[in-house]
């Protein structure tokens, strides 16, 4: 993408500032909030996107919990600390020195503590279940057509390797998309399932992160698939550590 074109923009992230100051006059884009240079040929990490979003905060997300090991993103938005690669730092703290540990998608996985809290490693979220309810249609979608279009969406719009879309389940009007990606499976350049899920979540809420003015256009054999509810469940490679007090 070069500055010789009129539109020096980032197709995959509208929350950027771009200018023709890259090598050879190439278009270079930096994430709002952090100023980190982003690769506009792929998805921007969720950590950098959340940091950018804090400059124009929106309503917090609230997710629900399907079992005792699935995490709920019920803390709302926060201004995260990201590492040089744009990943969430394992320990996050707020301005009042309250700290907690997060997983690779930035969801809290421990009780909150003080500055003495230790988070030894960033625990990977290796299984994401996206639970959707679609708006009523004349009839149910054909399952194989729906499966094919959702897989196409994740591989082409979100650039997720096809092998990471584990399954698409459908019982009208509920659609479940399972994303699986172990640490050992993720090669250099692979989109993270957490980032793909975040982009998808923002898309179905009508808050697309892509530069385009069109937003998500999801169709199954020409019939629009309109999502009216989204729940996302996160499962980590190591179960979260909450005190019993939180569970009562």
């Amino acid at each position: 993408h070069t500055a010789a074109q009129d539109n020096c923009t980032c197709p995959t992230n509208k929350m950027t500032v771009c200018s023709p100051d890259g090598p050879g006059g190439r278009c270079q884009c930096r994430a709002l909030g952090s100023g980190v240079a982003v690769d506009c040929s792929t998805l921007t990490s969720e950590c950098l996107l959340l940091k950018a979003r804090m400059s124009a905060p929106k309503n917090a997300r609230t997710l629900v919990r399907p079992n005792e090991h699935a995490l709920v993103d019920n803390d709302g938005l926060y201004d995260p600390d990201c590492d040089p690669e744009g990943r969430f730092k394992a320990r996050q703290c707020n301005q009042t020195s309250v700290c907690w540990c997060v997983n690779s998608v930035g969801v809290r996985r421990t009780d909150k503590g003080d500055l003495s809290l230790r988070c030894d490693e960033l625990v990977r979220t290796h299984h994401i279940l996206i639970d959707l309810r679609h708006r009523p249609t004349a009839g149910a979608f054909n399952h194989s057509d729906l499966d094919a279009e959702l897989r196409r969406l994740f591989r082409e719009r979100y650039r997720l390797h096809p092998k990471f879309v584990a399954a698409v389940h459908y019982e009208q009007p509920t659609i479940q998309i399972e994303l699986r990606q172990n640490t050992s499976q993720k090669a250099a350049g692979d989109v993270d399932i957490g980032d793909a899920a975040y982009y998808f979540e923002r898309d179905v809420k009508g808050e697309s992160l892509f530069q385009g003015r069109g937003g998500l256009d999801l169709r199954v054999r020409g019939e629009p698939l309109q999502v009216e509810r989204t729940l996302i469940y996160y499962l980590d490679e190591i179960p979260p550590k909450f005190s019993m007090k939180r569970l009562t």
Epitope: P11, H161, G189, G212, G214, L218
Partner: antibody, heavy 121, light 107 residues
């Protein structure tokens, strides 16, 4: 059935302009990024330009930047390539091809039959 | 810009032979590589996308492998109808460059 049909090719003098078109049918055109690819006689394939599904982003190979413009009219299921300041080296078969779903960057799963553009005095 | 280098530029093999074509990117492109087949006088046809995923309707004797910079297209048992020129293409971002092509002939 899914198809792409190009038109508008022909013989044109160097320095002149030409617009080629591609009409899509059998799929929801406005959901897909679209591309132009060309092939000079006896040569390999050369990617020319892409336009994203919603027209929000365009990219071009360096050799045509500033001379060629890709555009689309989703209401007419039509892709265009406006070629200005044509040169001898632009002589080629021009194919339109379907790219990514809700994207621009992806492999080309549907190709048109092509339209021949000859730049000659 | 990333360059795509294909080898060999041409090859001749017997029916039933295993044929391997390689494609090298000058920088890593993850899995964003496709292979196309173009028969003489015909339109290119997508064989493989995402480096190793077979396009619907393509015979299973075709397979792709690789990630990053080095990729391979294999025809496990060459058939007469496989006579064509094969191209690799990167599609991680623009420009979506093609390799120079490999012409496959029958001995």
């Amino acid at each position: 059935q899914v198809q792409l049909v190009e038109s508008g090719g022909g013989v044109v003098q160097p320095g002149r302009s030409l617009r080629v078109s591609c009409i899509a049918s059998g799929f929801f055109f406005s959901s897909y990024g679209m591309h132009w690819v060309r092939q000079a006689p006896g040569k390999g394939l050369e990617w020319v330009a892409v336009i994203w599904y919603d027209g929000s982003n365009e990219d071009y190979v360096d050799s045509v930047k500033g001379r060629f413009t890709i555009s689309r009219d989703n209401s007419k299921n039509t892709l265009y390539l406006q070629m200005n300041s044509l040169r001898g080296e632009d002589t080629a078969m021009y194919y339109c091809a379907r790219g990514g779903y809700n994207s621009g960057w992806w492999a080309f799963d549907i190709w048109g039959q092509g339209t021949m553009v000859t730049v000659s005095s | 810009d990333i360059q795509m280098t294909q080898s060999p530029s041409s090859l001749s093999a017997s029916v039933g032979d295993r044929v391997t074509i390689t494609c090298r990117a000058s920088q890593g492109i993850s899995h964003f590589l496709a292979w196309y087949q173009q028969k003489p006088g015909k339109v290119p046809k997508l064989l493989i996308y995402a480096a190793s995923t077979l396009q619907s309707g393509v015979p299973s004797r075709f397979s792709g492998s690789g990630s990053g910079t080095d990729f391979t297209l294999t025809i496990s048992s060459l058939q007469p109808e496989d006579v064509a020129t094969y191209y690799c293409q990167k599609f991680n971002s623009a420009p979506l460059t093609f390799g120079g092509g490999t012409k496959v002939e029958i001995k």
